[in-house]
């Protein structure tokens, strides 16, 4: 289960290899209390994967999730 303080998961590293978009069902942003800003993608198998919100490909994934 996600490591947290205040029950909010924080990310300490980011994924480098992008997953196929069709396998990502939702996302959320980690808390502003976390030391690293992060987007957490949730896969269809309910695994959580940390991604860097500054990356263009991450923003494009978020946009496609918002539109679907």
């Amino acid at each position: 289960s996600p490591y947290s303080s205040d029950t909010t998961p924080c990310c300490f590293a980011y994924i480098a290899r992008p997953l196929p978009r069709a396998h990502i069902k939702e996302y959320f942003y980690t808390s502003g209390k976390c030391s690293n800003p992060a987007v957490v993608f949730v896969t269809r198998k309910n695994r959580q994967v940390c991604a860097n919100p500054e990356k263009k490909w991450v923003r494009e994934y978020i946009n496609s999730l918002e539109m679907s």
């Epitope: 490591y3 998961p9 924080c10 480098a16 290899r17 196929p20 940390c50 490909w57």
Partner: antibody
């Protein structure tokens, strides 16, 4: 340190199939993807396809679609690459390689480098009549 | 034809500096996918040399460094040594709705004069 050990060299006839295995000491965690990369004599590296357990999917480079199948055994300790309808230009060294894909929330003390960080020793496949 | 473009060969004298370029497009490097670099010594499997654009795995000398900007990346080797003579490959990604492909450059042969 995880090791990837591949099956031995193969000599095949044109039109036949080859199946190469890649055994991971300690098994393949679903935090990792397993790719197959080939290298024809004197040529560069060519990614063929890979298995990503995290999302339970296998995908193939477009030029191998329909001719290549990548599978894993039930224990997730061995991954197989089967290439069908072999031609002489499939003569190459075939490598399996591991890559970290899952970085979840929480401590990352066991995190290794990104990229293809562990490679098998390679399996030479010769296609000749 | 490789998706990422590298010079086929570069050379340099011992002690000197060489750089190897890797050029992609908006659908790969330009989409902010990370670049990894590999060294392949003759008769050996490739070895990860640089990951996430500029990070060296443990054991890789500081003489090797990487950088990335926009649709191009580069590998720099300073203080060239005879044992650096090898093939070097850049690698990144290209994704779609149902695919996540690994892509390589065509490789660059480094000759130490």
């Amino acid at each position: 340190q995880v090791q990837l050990v591949q099956s031995g060299a193969e000599v095949k006839k044109p039109g036949s199939s080859v199946k190469v295995s890649c055994k991971a000491s300690g098994g393949i965690s679903d935090n990792y993807a397993l790719s197959w990369v080939r290298q024809a004599p004197g040529q560069g590296l060519e990614w063929m396809g890979g298995f990503i357990p995290l999302v339970d999917t296998t995908n193939y480079a477009q030029r191998f679609q329909g001719r290549l199948t990548i599978t894993a055994d039930d224990s997730m300790s061995t991954v197989y690459m089967e290439l069908r309808s072999l031609r002489s230009d499939d003569t190459a060294m075939y490598y399996c390689a591991r890559e970290q894909v899952a970085v979840g929330p929480g401590p990352t003390s066991d995190r290794g480098p990104d990229g293809l960080d562990v490679w098998g020793q390679g399996t030479m496949v010769t296609v000749s009549s | 034809q490789s998706v990422l473009t590298q010079p086929s060969s570069v050379s340099g004298a011992p002690g000197h500096r060489v750089t190897i370029s890797c050029t992609g497009s908006n659908s790969n490097l330009g989409a902010d996918y990370d670049v990894h670099w590999y060294q392949q010594l003759p008769g050996s499997a490739p070895k990860l040399l640089i990951y996430d654009n500029n990070i060296r795995p443990s054991g890789v000398p500081a003489r090797f460094s990487g950088s990335k900007s926009g649709t191009s990346a580069s590998l720099a080797i300073t203080g060239l040594q005879a044992e650096d003579e090898a093939d070097y490959y850049c690698q990144s990604y290209d994704t779609g709705l149902t695919s996540s492909d690994v892509i390589f450059g065509g490789g660059t042969k480094l000759t130490v004069l």
